[in-house]
Interface confidence: medium
């Protein structure tokens, strides 16, 4: 007789979740020599331990601490790239600019990127049918708490000039409710971070507005300034051109710097 299982509003755990996490861990540690000491079995055990047998609406950051400890990694100063609502471009950028890192370029972010997972109270099973939805069910679910935990840590360890890529096509270019707005902004350490530089990515080809003057950007500037961190903003009018120039900085059309505008 199949056991009764809690029905949540969100989609269930990604199929082959354990295999995917382990394969990603192996792949990551192979490609990043500085992480070769990491034992992927221990990483999986710690990941599993954070949510298996636990009520999936009562997960805490504490649950993920063993995993965070195993995945400890540092980014060189000036090399952290945060992003909000523009993940694909941020990742395309760090794939070209190999010395800059998003959270998903780090082990823990890489392991969990685009995956969903949850367990159930008092069983060792993974729930492949449904998982809690952040809005409809609860915010303290395994996936949301994971990203909150690792995002906090990522921001806390950043140093130098930190960059953030923001989506200029959205009504709220800076959204206080995003992970960047609610977690990362508040965990940048003024003792280590001299400045936050926002790159506002334009969507339309003919869009020549100065989105650095957007009210939400001004709000971000205010929050950052109050934390004793300097704020800069650049418009990236042509993201395609921007990536092209990152790939080929010597290209004559890139030398003029016309692909973005500075605002302090």
């Amino acid at each position: 007789v199949p056991r009764w299982r809690q029905q949540w509003s969100g989609s269930g755990t990604t199929s082959r979740f354990p295999e995917t996490v382990l394969a990603r861990c192996v792949k990551y540690t192979e490609v990043h020599p500085e992480m070769r000491h990491v034992d992927c079995q221990s990483v999986w055990d710690a990941f599993k331990g954070a949510f298996i047998s636990k009520y999936p609406c009562n997960i805490t950051e504490e649950d993920y601490q063993p995993l965070v400890k195993l995945g400890t990694q540092t980014v060189p100063c000036n090399k952290t790239l945060l992003w909000s609502r523009i993940k694909d471009l941020a990742h395309q950028f760090t794939q070209v600019q190999r010395d800059m890192f998003t959270l998903e370029d780090m082990l823990l972010g890489y392991l969990a990127d685009d995956l969903t997972w949850c367990g159930e109270f008092n069983t060792f099973e993974i729930n492949y049918q449904s998982c809690p939805d952040w809005r409809k069910d609860c915010s303290n679910n395994p996936v949301s708490v994971f990203w909150k935990t690792v995002s906090r840590r990522f921001a806390e360890t950043a140093c130098g000039v930190v960059h953030v890529m923001l989506n200029g096509s959205r009504s709220k270019i800076f959204d206080k409710n995003s992970t960047f707005g609610s977690v990362e902004v508040h965990n940048l350490q003024p003792e280590k971070v001299q400045a936050l530089e926002a790159w506002v990515i334009h969507g339309g080809r003919e869009d020549s507005r100065d989105l650095c003057q957007d009210p939400t950007i001004k709000e971000l500037e205010s929050i950052i300034s109050k934390r004793n961190i300097r704020f800069f903003c650049k418009n990236i009018y042509r993201p395609d051109k921007f990536l092209q120039c990152v790939k080929n900085p010597e290209d004559s059309s890139c030398l003029s710097g016309i692909h973005h505008h500075h605002h302090h």
């Epitope: 082959r16 354990p18 295999e19 995917t20 382990l22 394969a23 861990c25 192996v26 792949k27 540690t29 192979e30 020599p33 500085e34 070769r36 000491h37 990491v38 034992d39 992927c40 079995q41 221990s42 999986w44």
Partner: antibody
Framework: QVQLVQSGAEVKKPGSSVKVSCKAS????????ISWVRQAPGQGLEWMGR????????NYAQKFQGRVTITADESTSTAYMELSSLRSEDTAVYYC?????????????WGQGTLVTVSS | EIVMTQSPATLSVSPGERATLSCRAS??????LAWYQQKPGQAPRLLIY???TRATGIPARFSGSGSGTEFTLTISSLQSEDFAVYYC?????????FGQGTKVEIK
């Protein structure tokens, strides 16, 4: 007790192919990385490549690129190494080996080896 | 690829004595180095990984040290079962590569 059991010795003609199997028992197969290492008579060890069974991801040493194919069948917990265009210098014992835990860099568990003789 | 060079090629030691085997990498491999023991007709056996961590079941007389390009395997007091060929292997860069081996024989 985790074991890797390899297929038996093979005698092959130059120019032909050989496919060696490696069956894992006593552990979760799909999430362990399997490497293949060979050893010519009286010579040292030579790493050929590896596979992650759960994804099929492979990585090969440049020397064997284009001649070696490493695969894995999760349903039978078996990894395979196929070497084509055989020449006499390919005469060697071929080992499959598994990393400690889920990591493939150091090889903690080895198969018994399969002697492949290439001779006309 | 990274070339691993072991020395000496052969080491003659009396039982109970200390044996020191060297392994040099052509470029830094950090601490991503393993040591194996192989006896005639047998598969290699993992002794050390991470340059200095003993594998499960390996006696304390085996110890590894070094990082970067210079590594050492020390057998503090050779037992009769330790006479074998020893290989170092780096797993810092593709492809993983082995040294040519050091044969430890009875003096």
């Amino acid at each position: 007790q985790v074991q890797l059991v390899q297929s038996g010795a093979e005698v092959k003609k130059p120019g032909s192919s050989v496919k060696v199997s490696c069956k894992a028992s006593g552990g979760e197969f799909s999430i362990y990385v399997i490497s293949w290492v060979r050893q010519a008579p009286g010579q040292g060890l030579e790493w050929m490549g590896r596979v992650i069974p759960s994804t099929g991801d492979t990585n090969y040493a440049q020397k064997f690129q284009g001649r070696v194919t490493i695969t894995a069948d999760e349903s039978t917990s078996t990894a395979y190494m196929e070497l084509s265009s055989l020449r006499s210098e390919d005469t060697a014992v071929y080992y499959c080996a598994r990393g400690k835990a889920y990591y493939s860099g150091w090889l903690a568990i080895w198969g018994q080896g399969t002697l492949v003789t290439v001779s006309s | 690829e990274i070339v691993m060079t072991q020395s000496p090629a052969t080491l003659s030691v009396s039982p109970g004595e200390r044996a020191t085997l060297s392994c040099r990498a052509s470029q830094s491999v950090s601490s991503n180095l393993a040591w194996y023991q192989q006896k005639p007709g047998q598969a290699p056996r993992l002794l050390i990984y991470g340059a200095s961590t003993r594998a499960t079941g390996i006696p304390a007389r085996f110890s590894g040290s070094g990082s970067g390009t210079e590594f050492t395997l020390t057998i503090s007091s050779l037992q009769s079962e330790d006479f074998a060929v020893y290989y170092c292997q780096q797993y810092n860069n593709w492809p993983w590569t082995f040294g040519q081996g050091t044969k430890v024989e009875i003096k």
